[in-house]
């Protein structure tokens, strides 16, 4: 079997409320029943985990309660949303997909989505 391919958009602009959404799609080489999806942030050569979720095929994606990520899954496609972003969080966000069960394990890593975050301008003081 060949390696697993993961596709994600090259660029996404976060909303004024600091929310960014993108689709992570993977070409599954096997018949996985358990999949783990991780969002990684790459800054310089440092790679850190933003959030991770494991789901059973056909079930919903559940991130931890305190996670800044939410998501939904449909077949080999995961819709990811990252919240609470600020300008300093602008960077490359990599989608990592792991087919956990049954063996063999497969790893797939996307090329990353550059997320641009612009902090909203503070509202000017008003006399009214």
């Amino acid at each position: 079997c060949k390696a697993m391919h993961v596709a994600q958009p090259a660029v996404v602009l976060a909303s004024s409320r600091g929310i960014a959404s993108f689709v992570c799609e993977y070409a599954s080489p096997g018949k996985a029943t358990e999949v783990r999806v991780t969002v990684l942030r790459q800054a310089d050569s440092q790679v850190t985990e933003v959030c991770a979720a494991t789901y059973m095929m056909g079930n919903e994606l559940t991130f931890l309660d305190d996670s800044i990520c939410t998501g939904t899954s449909s077949g080999n496609q995961v819709n990811l949303t990252i919240q609470g972003l600020r300008a300093m969080d602008t960077g490359l966000y990599i989608c990592k997909v792991e087919l956990m069960y049954p063996p063999p394990y497969y790893l797939g890593i996307g090329n990353g989505t550059q997320i641009y975050v612009i902090d909203p301008e503070p509202c000017p003081d008003s006399d009214f």
Epitope: C1, A3, T48, M100, Y105, I109
Partner: antibody, heavy 105, light 98 residues
Framework: PGRSLRLSCAAS????????IHWVRQAPGKGLEWVAV????????DYADSVKGRFTISRDNSKKTLYLQMNSLRAEDTAVYYC???????????WGQGTLVTVSS | TLSLSPGERATLSCRAS??????LAWYQQKPGQAPRLLIY???SRATGIPDRFSGSGSGTDFTLTISRLEPEDFAVYYC?????????FGPGTKVDIK
């Protein structure tokens, strides 16, 4: 031969439960051989054919410790056994110093 | 085994039996020591690795290049695919002093 042994590997300095951990071995004067891997919460594991059914990998995330239970040991299991952490992007970025296991009659 | 002199260029090859995309790493091992990660993703240098080390290739054919050998570079080098289990290592290439 035929005896059992349990190896352990204590980790520190990182979020243990966020990483898969491998056992890799090296027979004297030979190359590296992958033995087993355990992922995240410990439910998912995989083994090399050469140890399947004889070795069991496990982890205790609360103690940040990895284990390898080796049963029915054979002379060919003689090797230095390394534990190694899986980096976020997949390779093995940190390795233990290794433990020599000798199986002799 | 590659027998070379300090200052020379070393080119090491690794061939996978089937495509591993770019999920390939290179490790350096010196006698009595644990392996050390040099290259991951076929071409990305690990933290703290000097830029004389470079990797290239994708699919089934990969290369590790050491542009100018330093005395501390004489060691054994292993490639490993990590895109699927089993996570196989190559047989290793020893780079020794000519």
């Amino acid at each position: 031969p035929g005896r059992s042994l349990r190896l352990s590997c204590a980790a520190s300095g990182f979020t243990f439960s966020s990483h898969g951990i491998h056992w890799v071995r090296q027979a004297p004067g030979k190359g590296l051989e992958w033995v087993a891997v355990i992922w995240y919460d410990g439910r998912n594991k995989d083994y090399a054919d050469s140890v399947k059914g004889r070795f069991t990998i496990s982890r205790d995330n609360s103690k940040k410790t990895l284990y390898l239970q080796m049963n029915s040991l054979r002379a060919e299991d003689t090797a230095v056994y390394y534990c190694a952490r899986v980096a976020p992007l997949g390779p093995l970025d940190y390795w233990g110093q290794g433990t020599l296991v000798t199986v002799s009659s | 085994t590659l027998s070379l002199s300090p200052g020379e260029r070393a080119t090491l090859s690794c061939r996978a039996s089937q495509s591993v995309s770019s999920y390939l790493a290179w490790y350096q091992q010196k006698p009595g020591q644990a392996p050390r990660l040099l290259i991951y993703g076929a071409s990305s240098r690990a933290t703290g690795i000097p830029d004389r080390f470079s990797g290239s290739g994708s699919g089934t054919d990969f290369t590790l290049t050491i542009s100018r050998l330093e005395p501390e570079d004489f060691a054994v080098y292993y490639c490993q695919q990590y895109g699927r289990s089993p996570f196989t290592f190559g047989p290793g290439t020893k780079v020794d002093i000519k």
